[in-house]
């Protein structure tokens, strides 16, 4: 599941990892666009073992993974992409 969140929080990620996470271990990926107090785009991977990892958006593997998830989600109903506007 790919989620895009627009939050009023500041940066959520203190430290970023770039270590490849196989798709079978990923529960969902949360994308926090830059802005609203955080100057950078953040990508948060929620793993199936309940752990959470912030991933460097420059890492090619996460870009390719998101691309595949977008492709899969666009052919699935309901579309599992959620957008939250700032209240």
């Amino acid at each position: 599941v790919l989620e895009v969140y627009y939050t009023s929080l500041r940066c959520r990620c203190v430290q970023e990892s770039s270590v490849f996470i196989p798709r079978r271990f990923i529960d969902r990926i949360q994308i926090l666009p830059r802005g609203n107090g955080c100057p950078r785009k953040e990508i948060i991977v929620w793993k199936k073992n309940k752990s959470i990892v912030c991933v460097d958006p420059q890492a090619e593997w996460i870009q390719r993974m998101m691309e595949v998830l977008r492709k899969r989600s666009s052919s699935t109903l309901p579309v599992p992409v959620f957008k939250r506007k700032i209240p």
């Epitope: 490849f20 420059q58 595949v68």
Partner: antibody, heavy 120, light 107 residues
């Protein structure tokens, strides 16, 4: 058997254009990123550009971005490299290669290479 | 961009020897490193990706290791057919970049 076959290169004048093609067979073309890499005789490898599964995402070597265009025709299983305003520094052997997907990385199959000479 | 440096342009070895080819990245590439072999007159061939994953069909005498900025390709017992150029490449972030290459010569 995975096969990548590049079109004939050749001799071109500085400032002119040339379009290379690479015909893929033996695998599901749309499952892979594709890339172009070049090699100046007796020199190292230089990555040129790559393209995603459906052509919606392309990446280039910064210095070539304004002159080279990578594209693909998934109906025909062909990868292209359109090169314009060619310079003598573009003289090289150009290879097309399969460039992995979302879980596999590395260029695992390469074409035989095609030689491009830019000279007056 | 990430710069990869292969400090040895040439390495001389004998059949049966163990040899290690090194590659240093200008920044942490988080094990996103591939190794290629290019024999004279041939196209490059993938040996290793993700720093240590051997590509299908690659003999087990080839081993990749490393993390952070330092990576090594080791050939445990060099064979005559291993005479070739060896390149490292980072697949962490585009533009993909290659090391300058190390030419393995057999004594």
């Amino acid at each position: 058997e995975v096969k990548l076959v590049e079109s004939e290169g050749g001799l071109v004048q500085p400032g002119s254009s040339m379009k290379l093609s690479c015909t893929a067979s033996g695998f599901t073309f749309t499952d892979y990123y594709m890339t172009w890499v070049r090699q100046v005789p007796e020199k190292g490898l230089e990555w040129v550009a790559n393209i995603n599964y459906d052509g919606s995402r392309t990446n280039y070597l910064d210095s070539l971005k304004s002159r080279f265009i990578i594209s693909r025709d998934n109906a025909k299983n062909i990868l292209y490299l359109q090169m314009s305003s060619l310079k003598s520094e573009d003289t090289a052997t150009y290879y097309c290669a399969r460039d992995g997907n979302y879980h596999f990385y590395g260029m695992d199959y390469w074409g035989q290479g095609t030689s491009v000479t830019v000279s007056s | 961009d990430f710069v990869l440096t292969q400090s040895h342009k040439f390495m001389s070895t004998s059949v049966g020897d163990r040899v290690s080819i090194t590659c240093k990245a200008s920044q942490d590439v988080s094990t996103a490193v591939a190794w290629y072999q290019q024999k004279p007159g041939q196209s490059p061939q993938l040996l290793i990706y993700w720093a240590s994953t051997r590509h299908t069909g690659v003999p087990d005498r080839f081993t990749g290791s490393g993390s952070g900025t330092d990576y090594t390709l080791t050939i445990s017992s060099v064979q005559a057919e291993d005479l070739a150029l060896y390149y490292c490449q980072q697949h962490y972030s585009t533009p993909w970049t290659f090391g300058g290459g190390t030419k393995l010569e057999i004594k």
